[in-house]
């Protein structure tokens, strides 16, 4: 490439490696890079490459190029996850069954121990893995309000597939709230969409952790992979960080 | 300011400002600025400066900071509005009035003079009044399908206002398809959200251009605020240029 | 688009995205990021021409202002336009930990 | 962020937003544009201190990463980040025509 | 290639009516305004007036408002002008011209000279 | 109507001289001048618009320039094709005037 005077590619490819090498760290918030004198010898834990995979792998919903990101999402999120109550937990005695809705519920002490405080949480995806659908399906995203109070989310509208396909949906306001809030369980509803004419409110989309009768090793994989709170925040001690640096300038 | 050598401020401001008048003149793909010669004498038709006002005012669900742009969204979009079909026209005749439902309609020969080309359009929102409001209102739009169903399209969550306040839903893959079609008149709904549980559903948002009896001068202004599509789209003659352009490189 | 699938096929001496792969161990030295290997960081680089609009040619020169200095910029440089995250896995202690980076890596550039 | 509240109330050195107003009259001798007269343009100017992560005060570097070299770049710039469209009125021959021109104001700036 | 192409010279009687055809090929013909301009010998171009074939739409320089009439036709994208009660000092080229909106005549035909001799 | 007087009239000069025609218009015209090229028995031919922008396939030794009611056009080295008679025309207000032209012949 030849400007006014000739690029040195190898020297811009020199630069811009020596700036990875800060930026990754700097992102991270760690001065030096890690030991790696403790670490566990053999391969990863299977949660910790599940919850990489969930990461790096798009989901439909998603955009595929980030928006520009405001200052203090320039830092590096800590992903966890946090996976719903199984369905044999008493709570979901509570919510009788109906053709229309099915009920997810999650433990906040897992959600605090994952997040301490709501200002770090930068987003939360309520992910569902929708099995195969023969029909066009309009569902709506509710959260628990109050005693036996709905709150209207969100809505999709599921193209019928052969395929099992995950979904994604935005739940980052409310998991704020509920770690602001002194709740023990909080939950969410998925319903059939009903218009004000129709009156075929039946959900038929099978979503995979509701089903029964299943055969003991599939049921494991089943269990793993039902709906879940995908959570981004900033690490509490980098958020300290962030905040004593917030008005150097 | 200062870096190694003097920034001559004076210098950057020249660069800039004659950069910014290639910029006008390449987005609106004009050779040179247009001739004054045959502009009409006197102030602006209401009409234009009615339609300029709707595209300079933010309205609600409109986000303040566009997405980075794909390179043919570079070119400026001519800005046209197509009112609604007045509601005394015969066609809101074959749509029973409900407590839950208001219905636009929308001659698409209008919808064709603004924009020839489906390709051609960028984008389109149904622009609504909506007055005040007591309670919070959960809305939900659907498209006029086919002889008597409707396509559910989005929904909005409004909340209780004492002053009046623009409602913008982005319709352009509708109007898009409206374009492609042979119809005359085709129509959105809005309609209250109905829980599969609630039976209150009456739509309680009041939107300019359904309620009756006003004074003269009011109903004017009235008709004027009606619901109206307002449409981005490439001008036909910029759109050839693109093309041919497109694979110089 | 300035983006991979144009430059990595052509030989665009303006503006473009140019090929970069980092492999953490061999090009910097680390070890303690499990998860991946390396990554495409890949990089912008190339001359945007500043464009005066008083120039003689000037259909020419309007042709070019989409590519060359879309922001009408006094000085435009060739900077990244659309930008991916990268998970990566690393060990804290004995804690695994599963972290998205932002921005890290570069699909397409632009003039700006 | 490198916007026009910190920027036009400070005398930053570095990479910030710089107030200009157009008047399209005045500065560029049109009277074409019937509406708006002008707009504030603005535009980034300032430099972008390429940091090398080798450097002896190491810690301090990282904390400079986000201002002045968050994309990691060979050569950082300051270049627009937020961007806002422009609607005009001008007439062609007889007929007026509303448009709307994007990414035309300035609203912050950022080293790329 | 853009092009437009005239009708032949003419020869006419004081008080007669001449009509000019102007063809025209390479482009849309709807999309530009056509002009007609006239340059009497040894003289400088004048400006008659414009019709846009899109609309109808047409304007006369107020020297030739009443005698000059311009219409198209649409379908062989071709514009006329005719020009009534001729005086010798019409004798001239005339030219039809496309014009773009920065104000500018970007093609022009190659002429079309108009004697007026008793 | 804005009155145009271009001057000079008439002008010899040799290939490889450097020529300059002016244009004064009655009023300010935002830049909106033009310049043509006319040849006997050839179609009339745009060189410049709007003061200073050349017409595409025309040569850069033409060039424009000028402000408010001043424009000049300006030949950097005559070539034997550059002989013909040159017009300026305003496209600000309408009726659209030209000068009386610029006769430029060989020495």
């Known amino acids: 490439l030849s400007t006014c005077k000739t690029i040195d590619m190898e020297l811009v490819k020199r630069k811009r490696i020596e700036a990875i090498r800060g930026q990754i760290l700097s992102k991270l918030r760690l001065a030096s890079p890690p030991s790696q004198g403790e670490v566990p010898p053999g391969p990863l834990p299977e949660a910790v490459l599940a919850l990489y995979n969930s990461t790096r792998d798009r989901v439909a919903g998603e955009s595929a190029e980030p928006e520009p990101e405001p200052e203090a999402d320039y830092y590096a999120k800590e992903v966890t996850r946090v996976l719903m109550v199984e369905t044999h937990n008493e709570i979901y005695d509570k919510f009788k069954q109906s053709t229309h809705s099915i009920y997810m519920f999650f433990n906040t002490s897992e959600l605090r121990e994952a997040v301490p405080e709501p200002v770090l949480l930068s987003r939360a995806e309520l992910r569902l893995l929708r099995l195969k659908l023969k029909v066009e399906q309009h569902v709506e995203l509710y959260q628990k309000y109050s005693n036996n109070s709905w709150r209207y989310l969100s809505n999709r509208l599921l193209a019928p597939s052969d395929s099992p396909e995950w979904l994604s949906f935005d739940v980052t306001g409310v998991v704020r709230q509920w770690l602001s809030r002194g709740g023990e369980i909080e939950g969410f509803r998925l319903s059939a969409h009903c218009s004000c004419d129709s009156r075929d409110n039946t959900l038929q989309v099978d979503i995979n952790g509701f089903t029964t009768g299943r055969r003991g090793d599939l049921a494991t994989i089943h269990g793993m992979n039902r709906p879940f709170l995908l959570l981004m925040a900033t690490p509490l001690e980098r958020a300290q960080h962030l905040q004593s640096s917030r008005h150097r300038r | 300011l200062s870096t190694c050598k003097t920034i001559d401020m004076e210098l950057v401001k020249r660069k800039r400002i004659e950069a910014i008048r290639g910029q006008i003149l390449s987005k609106l793909r004009l050779a040179s600025p247009p001739s004054q010669g045959e502009v009409p004498p006197g102030p602006l038709p209401e009409a234009v400066l009615a339609l300029y006002n709707s595209t300079r005012d933010r309205v609600a669900g409109e986000s303040a900071e566009p997405e980075p742009e794909p390179e043919a969204d570079y070119y400026a979009k001519e800005v046209t509005r197509v009112l609604m079909v007045e509601t005394h026209n015969e066609i809101y005749d074959k749509f029973k009035q409900s407590t839950h439902s208001i219905y636009m309609f929308f001659n698409t020969s209008e919808l064709r003079e603004a924009v020839p080309e489906p390709v051609l359009l960028s984008r389109a929102e149904l622009r609504l009044l909506r007055l005040k409001l007591k309670v919070e209102q959960h809305v939900e739009l659907y498209q006029k399908y086919s002889n008597n169903s409707w396509r559910y399209l989005s929904n909005r969550l409004l909340a209780p206002s004492d002053s009046p306040e623009w409602l913008s839903f982005d319709v352009t893959g509708v109007v898009r398809q409206w374009l492609s079609r042979g119809g005359e008149i085709e129509g959105f709904r809005l309609s209250a959200h109905c829980s599969c549980d609630s039976r209150d559903n009456t739509l309680q948002v009041d939107i300019n251009g359904f309620t009756t009896g006003r004074r003269g001068d009011l109903a004017t202004i009235h008709g004027m605020n009606r619901p109206f599509l307002l449409l981005m789209a490439t001008p036909l003659e910029r759109a050839q240029h693109l093309q041919s352009s497109r694979h110089r490189r | 688009a300035l983006d991979t699938n144009y430059c990595f096929s052509s030989t665009e001496k303006n503006c473009c995205v140019r090929q970069l792969y980092i492999d953490f161990r061999k090009d910097l030295g680390w070890k303690w990021i499990h998860e991946p290997k390396g990554y495409h960081a890949n990089f912008c680089l190339g001359p945007c021409p500043y464009i005066w609009s008083l120039d003689t040619q000037y259909s020419k020169v309007l042709a070019l202002y989409n590519q060359h200095n879309p922001g009408a910029s006094a000085a435009p440089c060739c900077v990244p336009q659309a930008l991916e995250p990268l998970p990566i896995v690393y060990y804290v202690g004995r804690k695994p930990k599963v972290e998205q980076l932002s921005n890290m890596i570069v699909r397409s550039c632009k003039c700006s | 962020a490198l916007d026009t509240n910190y920027c036009f109330s400070s005398t930053e050195k570095n990479c910030c937003v710089r107030q200009l107003y157009i008047d399209f009259r005045k500065d560029l001798g049109w009277k074409w544009i019937h509406e708006p007269k002008g707009y504030h343009a603005n535009f980034c100017l300032g430099p972008c201190p390429y940091i090398w992560s080798l450097d002896t005060q190491y810690s301090k570097v990282l904390a400079l990463y986000n201002q002045h070299n968050p994309g990691a770049s060979a050569a950082p710039c300051c270049v627009p980040q937020a961007l806002e469209p422009l609607p005009i009125v001008y007439y062609v021959g007889r007929k007026p025509k509303v448009e709307q021109l994007s990414n035309m104001i300035v609203r912050s700036c950022k080293c790329s | 290639e853009v092009q437009l192409v005239q009708s032949g010279a003419e020869v006419k009687k004081p008080g007669a009516s001449v009509k000019v055809s102007c063809k025209a090929s390479?482009?849309?013909?709807?999309?530009?305004?056509m002009h007609w301009v006239r340059q009497a010998p040894g003289q400088g171009l004048e400006w008659m007036g414009r019709?846009?074939?899109?609309?109808?739409?047409?304007k006369y320089a107020q020297k030739f408002q009443g005698r000059a009439t311009l219409t198209v036709d649409t379908s062989t994208s071709t514009a006329y002008m005719e020009l009534s009660r001729l005086r010798s000092d019409d004798t001239a080229v005339y030219y039809c011209?496309?014009?773009?909106?920065?104000?500018?005549?970007?093609?022009w035909g190659q002429g079309t000279l108009v004697t007026v001799s008793s | 109507d804005i009155q145009m007087t271009q001057s000079p009239s008439s002008l010899s000069a040799s290939v490889g001289d450097r020529v300059t025609i002016t244009c004064r218009a009655s009023q300010d015209i935002y830049n909106y001048l033009n310049w043509y090229q006319q040849k006997p028995g050839k179609a009339v031919k745009l060189l410049i618009y709007y003061t200073s922008y050349l017409e595409t396939g025309v040569p850069s030794r033409f060039s424009g320039s000028g402000s408010g009611t001043d424009y000049t056009l300006t030949i950097s080295s005559l070539q034997p094709e550059d002989f013909a008679t040159y017009f300026c025309?305003?496209?600000?207000?309408?009726?659209?005037?030209f000068g009386q032209g610029t006769k430029l012949e060989i020495k």
């Open positions: 019709i846009d074939p899109q609309s109808g739409g047409i």
């Open positions: 025309q305003q496209g600000d207000t309408l009726p659209w005037t």
């Open positions: 390479g482009y849309t013909f709807t999309s530009y305004d």
């Open positions: 011209a496309r014009y773009d909106h920065g104000g500018y005549f970007d093609v």
